[in-house]
């Protein structure tokens, strides 16, 4: 399955809207720094196939997209920025969606990779802690802020490799 | 608010098959994992597996994995289980629950069909 | 597969004494990946306390969680008529996630 050529340019678009969502400084936050234990491993694109890969960055996106359709996550942003953010990503959902569907349809494709999902997931599981934690402060949100660009970059650089795979 | 309806009862015999449903309202469907689980009479819970409604990918329980078959229908925001070569084993409350994190981990649940196998 | 052993199967308490539920994991469970369930007779569990030591929405501040690797605990600190119920600890650290067999809870 070949991700169009307008999915690179959302990722792109989705990390500018990202950036620009920041309102306080980042400095002004640096005692709520945390490590989320980003799983860099999933994101290497080396122990395993395109269908696979496709797979994890499906519940990366759509994780990201959960994380900032809150409640929480409303009151936190300026709200036409947050609407076209969550329009990149949900963009890029569609197009995930239809690659992880089409694999589906090949018998021979190798099974997901249950424990790299379930890495996803826990990472967000700290993500989503820590803000509870935090009580959805702005700092925290600042913090969980700056940990998804920093995702969504790992998830473009493997989207990139997979297209050289091609 | 966030809704699993699920049939109340299913009578079958055994060696049958039976395709229980889990109808979610009050939130966007394809954006969760929907688990579902087992509960014999007076016993515990058993997690069978999960899918994303979004493409369909599945994880089960490698207990379950010749037993349940899970699938949804994007269109009447449904997900299904079929059940095969049903036996009084079988016999048991079958849970549908939504996927989350954090307090939304299984903040949803389903009332339960209670499948009954007998002749 | 992991597995949940919860002591003790049956339990009963007066009003307003403590009780502490156990579950035990045959390997070590990451804290955040632990969770605790309550279900009445007729009823779908209910989310109870998450993450280990977070109280549910709605659930009373009488109840407590506490743990870590392979020991975790809920405590009630003042047992009420309507806590009478079976507690289920569950884990997500790992595939296939695994439920505990449950202690039912009733009131003397």
């Known amino acids: 399955c070949d991700l169009p050529q307008t999915h690179s340019l959302g990722n792109r678009r989705a990390l500018i809207l990202l950036a620009q969502m920041g309102r306080i400084s980042h400095f002004s936050c640096l005692k709520d720094r945390h490590d989320f234990g980003f799983p860099e491993e999933e994101f290497d694109g080396h122990q395993f196939q395109k269908a696979q890969a496709i797979s994890v960055l499906h519940e990366m996106i759509q994780q990201t997209f959960n994380l900032f359709s809150t409640e929480d996550s409303s009151a936190a942003w300026e709200q036409s920025l947050l609407e076209k953010f969550s329009t990149e990503l949900y963009q890029q959902l569609n197009d995930l969606e239809a690659c992880v569907i089409q694999e589906v349809g090949v018998e021979e494709t190798p099974l997901m990779n249950e424990d790299s999902i379930l890495a996803v997931r826990k990472y967000f599981q700290r993500i989503t802690l820590y803000l509870t934690e935090k009580k959805y402060s702005p700092c925290a949100w600042e913090v969980v802020r700056a940990e998804i660009m920093r995702s969504l970059s790992f998830s473009t650089n493997l989207q990139k490799r997979l297209r050289r795979k091609d | 608010q966030v809704q699993l309806q699920q049939p109340g009862a299913e009578l079958v015999k055994p060696g049958a098959s039976v395709k229980l449903s889990c109808k979610a309202s009050?939130?966007?469907?394809?954006?969760?994992?929907m688990h579902w689980v087992k509960q014999r009479p007076g016993q515990g819970l058993e997690w069978i597996g999960e899918?994303?409604?979004?493409?369909?990918?599945?994880i089960y329980n490698e207990n379950f994995k010749s037993k349940a078959t899970l699938t949804v229908d994007k269109s009447s925001i449904t997900a299904f289980m079929q059940l095969s070569s049903l036996t009084s084993e079988d016999s048991a409350v079958y849970f549908c629950?939504?996927?989350?994190?954090?307090?939304?981990?299984?903040?949803?649940w389903g009332q339960g069909t209670l499948v009954t196998v007998s002749a | 597969q992991i597995v949940l052993t919860q002591s003790p199967a049956i339990m009963s308490a007066s009003p307003g004494e403590k009780v502490t539920l156990t579950c035990s994991a045959g390997?070590?469970?990451?804290?955040?990946?632990l969770y605790w369930y309550q279900q009445k007779p007729g009823s779908s569990p209910k989310l109870w306390i998450y993450?280990?030591?977070n109280l549910a929405s709605g659930v009373p501040a009488r109840f407590s969680g506490s743990g870590s690797g392979t020991s975790y605990s809920l405590t009630i600190s003042s047992m009420e008529a309507e806590d009478a119920a079976s507690y289920f600890c569950?884990?997500?650290?790992?595939?296939?996630?695994?439920f505990g067999s449950g202690t039912k809870l009733e009131i003397k």
């Open positions: 993450s280990t030591s």
């Open positions: 899918i994303n409604p979004s493409h369909g990918r599945t």
């Open positions: 009050g939130y966007t469907f394809t954006n969760y994992w």
């Open positions: 629950a939504r996927g989350g994190l954090g307090p939304a981990w299984f903040a949803y």
């Open positions: 569950h884990q997500w650290s790992s595939y296939p996630f695994t």
């Open positions: 390997s070590s469970v990451d804290s955040s990946y």
